[in-house]
C-alpha cells in the first residue's frame, strides 16, 4: 500500500500592487496533480506581519488571496496543499510548506519618519491628517502623503497640503467617494537632499475616526411640575440620527447636577421648585452601531434658563457660549 503524497504549491509569492499595504498572495498548483484529476485540492494559507504572535489562516480552493498588511514591518507567509479525505481513502494528506516573505527595504533611520500622525474625519465629510516632521530633519525635508482604498485604480497623492515654514505638515483630502467601512491606507514618505527619509504606513477605517459637529437647537420643555425635558437636534451633515450617542452636562445653580450618556435627542430631568438656574450642554459621538470607535464632538453652545418660573410650558433662551 503506497503512501499518498502531494507536492506544495509552486511559485508562491507576495505581490505588491502599490496600494500601500493591500497585497496579493498568489501561487500555482503543485506539480504532479495528475493522480488527483477528479479531486478539488485545497490550500491552507498562513500569513502575518513579522513580529505578530498569531498567524491568520485561510483555506481556499483558489490560487490567490488578498489582504491588508502593515508595511512598516515585514510580512511572512506559508502555504501547503491539502488533499481532502475523499481523495485519499479516508485521511487528509498535506504537503510540506512553501514559504515566502516580503518587506519594503527601509530608507533612512526611523527618527526621520513623521511623528504624531493624526487623522480626523470631520462630520463624516472632510478628512484631515496632520503630522510633525521627523526628529533632527533639516528644513529642506518635505513629506508627501499618498492614499488608497478599494475603489481607487491606484494610490493618489494629496493635492492640498497644510504647510508650516514651507514644509508639508498635513493634508486636506478631497471628497472621498464610497470610502468608509473599508481599510484606508496611507503612506507618508519624504525627500531631503541631506539624507534619506523613512516612510511611514498607516491603516484605519474612516467611520472610526469621525468627529461630528456638536448638536444644535437646544431647548427646554416642561413635562410636569417636577420634570423638564431637554431636547436638541442632530447637526447638519450626512450622519443619521441612529448613529449618535450623546453626552449631556447639566448644571443646576452652578453645581453639576448630572452627566449622562444617552442614545436619543432627549433627556428628562427631575427638578425641584428651588431651582433658580438650569443650564445644559451636549456633545455627540458616533455610536457602536455605526463604528468601532469615534471622537467626541466639541460641546454645543450652552442653553440656560434663569430667573423665571420653571412652570412655563417652554423655556427657550438665547445661547451662551460654553467654556
Amino acid at each position: 500500500d503506497t503512501e499518498i503524497k502531494v507536492n506544495p504549491p509552486q511559485d508562491f509569492e507576495i505581490v505588491d500592487p502599490g496600494y500601500l499595504g493591500y497585497l496579493y498572495l498568489q501561487w500555482q498548483p503543485p506539480l504532479s496533480l495528475d493522480h488527483f484529476k477528479e479531486c478539488t485540492v485545497e490550500y491552507e494559507l498562513k500569513y502575518r506581519n513579522i513580529g505578530s504572535e498569531t498567524w491568520k489562516t485561510i483555506i481556499t480552493k483558489n490560487l490567490h488571496y488578498k489582504d491588508g498588511f502593515d508595511l512598516n514591518k515585514g510580512i511572512e507567509a506559508k502555504i501547503h496543499t491539502l488533499l481532502p479525505w475523499q481523495c485519499t481513502n479516508g485521511s487528509e494528506v498535506q504537503s510540506s510548506w512553501a514559504e515566502t516573505t516580503y518587506w519594503i527595504s527601509p530608507q533612512g533611520i526611523p527618527e526621520t519618519k513623521v511623528q504624531d500622525m493624526d487623522c480626523v474625519y470631520y462630520n463624516w465629510q472632510y478628512l484631515l491628517c496632520s503630522w510633525k516632521p521627523g526628529i533632527g530633519v533639516l528644513l529642506d525635508t518635505n513629506y508627501n502623503l499618498f492614499y488608497w482604498y478599494e475603489g481607487l485604480d491606484h494610490a493618489l497623492q494629496c493635492v492640498d497640503y497644510i504647510k508650516a515654514d514651507g514644509q508639508n505638515i498635513g493634508c486636506r483630502f478631497p471628497y472621498l467617494e464610497a470610502s468608509d467601512y473599508k481599510d484606508f491606507y496611507i503612506c507618508v514618505n519624504g525627500s531631503s537632499e541631506n539624507k534619506p527619509i523613512r516612510s511611514s504606513y498607516f491603516t484605519f477605517q474612516l467611520q472610526n475616526i469621525v468627529k461630528p459637529l456638536p448638536p444644535v437647537y437646544l431647548t427646554f420643555t416642561r413635562e410636569s411640575s417636577c420634570e423638564i425635558k431637554l431636547k436638541w437636534s442632530i447637526p447638519l451633515g450626512p450622519i443619521p440620527a441612529r448613529c449618535f450617542d450623546y453626552e449631556i452636562e447639566i448644571r443646576e445653580d452652578d453645581t453639576t447636577l448630572v452627566t449622562a450618556t444617552v442614545e436619543n435627542e432627549t433627556y428628562t430631568l427631575k427638578t425641584t421648585n428651588e431651582t433658580r438656574q438650569l443650564c445644559f450642554v451636549v456633545r455627540s459621538k458616533v455610536n457602536i452601531y455605526c463604528s468601532d470607535d469615534g471622537i467626541w464632538s466639541e460641546w454645543s453652545d450652552k442653553q440656560c434658563w434663569e430667573g423665571e418660573d420653571l412652570s412655563k410650558k417652554t423655556l427657550l433662551r438665547h445661547h451662551h457660549h460654553h467654556h
Epitope: V15, G18, Y24, Q26, P29, T40, K61, N62, L63, H64
Partner: nanobody
C-alpha cells in the same frame, strides 16, 4: 475546455527582438492572471513576467528593463515583447493563465505548449 496557443518564437541574433503572442480560447469565464514562464531542459521553470490582479505588472530576474508584457482583454491575449536578447534567454517560453471556467467555481491554472526562442552565442 481551454486552449492557449503561443506564437512568435524563433531564432534571433544577440541584441535582437521578438514578440511572443498567446491567444486563449475556450469556455473561460474570467482571466485573473496572465504570465510568461520559460524553461530550459534540466532546469526548473522560471517566471518571466506577469499581469496579475488589478492589472499589476511584475517582471522577474533579467527580464526587468528588457521585456514588456501586455494584454488585450478583448482578444483574450497576452504578449511578451523581448528586446536586447541574449544567449541566456534561450528557452521554451510558455504562456500561463489563471482563471475561472464558465462551468467552474474556483480558479484554475492553464498552460500553453510553449514556443522555442533561440539566441545563439
Amino acid at each position: 475546455q481551454v486552449q492557449l496557443q503561443e506564437s512568435g518564437g524563433g531564432l534571433v541574433q544577440p541584441g535582437g527582438s521578438l514578440r511572443l503572442s498567446c491567444e486563449v480560447s475556450g469556455s473561460i469565464f474570467s482571466i485573473n492572471r496572465m504570465a510568461w514562464y520559460r524553461q530550459v531542459p534540466e532546469k526548473e521553470r522560471e517566471m518571466v513576467a506577469q499581469i496579475t490582479y488589478g492589472d499589476t505588472i511584475k517582471y522577474y530576474g533579467s527580464a526587468k528593463g528588457r521585456f514588456t508584457i501586455s494584454r488585450d482583454s478583448a482578444k483574450n491575449a497576452v504578449y511578451l515583447q523581448m528586446n536586447s536578447l541574449k544567449p541566456e534567454d534561450t528557452a521554451v517560453y510558455r504562456c500561463n493563465i489563471v482563471g475561472v471556467l464558465t462551468t467552474g467555481h474556483y480558479e484554475d491554472s492553464f498552460w500553453g505548449q510553449g514556443t522555442q526562442v533561440t539566441v545563439p552565442s
